[in-house]
């Protein structure tokens, strides 16, 4: 969470941004809020990126003005125009690329004053893992798959029954490059699993951490997955 202040005459306005992460190839949002101002035509929003000449996006007089926009962002950005008067300057970013990572500035000018705040935007790939029982194996085993990760993550297994156990000797993890030659498919197999136990497959890089849980009993298989972005907020 980054809060910036600005001065215009005697007036400060508070601008707040949140560090966030973008999933490459998907659409993302760079979050920025400011003190609301009912006078829409007097609000100017400018998004800038460190190291880039030209603007990422500009919104003024109630509409976009992209005449100064850098070409790498052409056709890829939008503010939530109907939410500007309530203080939302967040930026939608289409088809996130690795090169979108960096430091952004959200600059605001209203009839009340002006202010800005920086935002660190990380880019990578992250996806939910899915665990299945591998019945083809000679012994009972579990297969954990996640379709898109970048940078290359670490993979670890844990179990409810054998808490603290090291499963690296009884698991095998591989990373397969996807067709776009950036992201990778993660596959990890855990061997010699036992019935009536809950196993967790944990995939983590510097952007996100994902966990898939599976509970195998004689009568059913229960699964659960979750994903959290790291260092956000």
């Amino acid at each position: 969470l980054i809060i910036g202040f600005g001065i215009s005459g005697k007036h400060f306005i508070t601008v707040t941004t949140f560090t966030s992460a973008g999933n490459i190839g998907e659409d993302g949002t760079l979050s920025c809020t400011f003190e609301p101002d009912i006078k829409l035509n007097g609000i100017v929003i400018q998004w800038l990126k460190e190291g880039i000449k030209g603007l990422v996006h500009e919104f003024k007089e109630g509409k976009d003005d992209l005449s100064q926009q850098h070409e790498m962002f052409r056709g890829r950005t939008a503010v939530f125009a109907d939410q500007v008067v309530v203080g939302n300057a967040s930026l939608r970013l289409k088809n996130v690329q690795l090169t979108d990572a960096g430091t952004y500035t959200c600059y605001i000018r209203t009839s009340k004053g002006k202010g800005n705040a920086n935002l660190e935007y990380k880019t990578g790939a992250f996806s939910m893992p899915e665990i299945n029982v591998d019945y083809n194996a000679s012994s009972e085993s579990l297969r954990c798959e996640a379709p898109r990760w970048f940078p290359q993550p670490t993979v670890a297994w844990a179990s409810q029954v054998d808490q603290g156990a090291n499963f690296s000797e009884v698991s095998n993890t591989s990373f397969e490059l996807n067709s776009e030659n950036v992201t990778m498919k993660v596959v990890s197999v855990l061997y010699n699993v036992t019935i009536n136990n809950t196993y967790s497959c944990m995939i983590e890089n510097d952007i996100a951490k994902a966990t898939g849980d599976i509970k195998v009993t004689d009568s059913e298989v229960k699964r659960r997955s979750q994903l959290q972005l790291l260092n956000s907020g």
Epitope: S67, G75, N95
Partner: antibody, heavy 119, light 107 residues
Amino acid sequence: QVQLQESGPGLVKPSETLSLTCTVSGGSISSYYWSWIRQPPGKGLEWIGYIYYSGSTNNNPSLKSRVTISVDTSKNQFSLKLISVTAADTAVYYCARVYNNYDWGFDYWGQGTLVTVSS
Amino acid sequence: EIVMTQSPATLSVSPGERATLSCRASQSVSSNLAWYQQKPGQAPRLLIYGASTRATGIPARFSGSGSGTEFTLTIRSLQSEDFAVYYCQQYHNWPLTFGGGTKLEIK
């Protein structure tokens, strides 16, 4: 109500230059992106390229560097030039407005003009 | 470039029934997809953008769904004026690309 009207010759000789102009009425050319799209007879649609009122453009790589799109804000017009045409460039050429700066659907279209490339 | 594939090429449906048209992208386009209707001798007409948002003035019987690589345009209770060619178009990446079209004809 925004209206678009294509104009230009309907017949162009092979190896020559195809030139079309789109006149926008009922609204300003500023604040929107504008595109050219073509459709060969009996076939599907192909995006040619876009222009913004500030003059920034982007073209379909399939047309290599044969395409030039320009804008004249004082006349509320934008134009297409396609050099070194062949019979494969025979198509109905449409000009269209991009719906908004993020959702690149085309909400207003000209009626289209058929350009035939033939000697 | 992203290749858009529409199926079927021709769909025969009776008036009053439901038509389901499919569009598949060669890679994920998120929700950055539009649908158009084109009648003979006319320019295409924008029906749907953002995969599921109806454009201004488009009747509620038209609905779009899907994200990623699989998309569907559904027209319920077909009217006589709905028989036309339908195109999908992605705007996730340059160049913008269209599908080959689905011709919706009267059964």
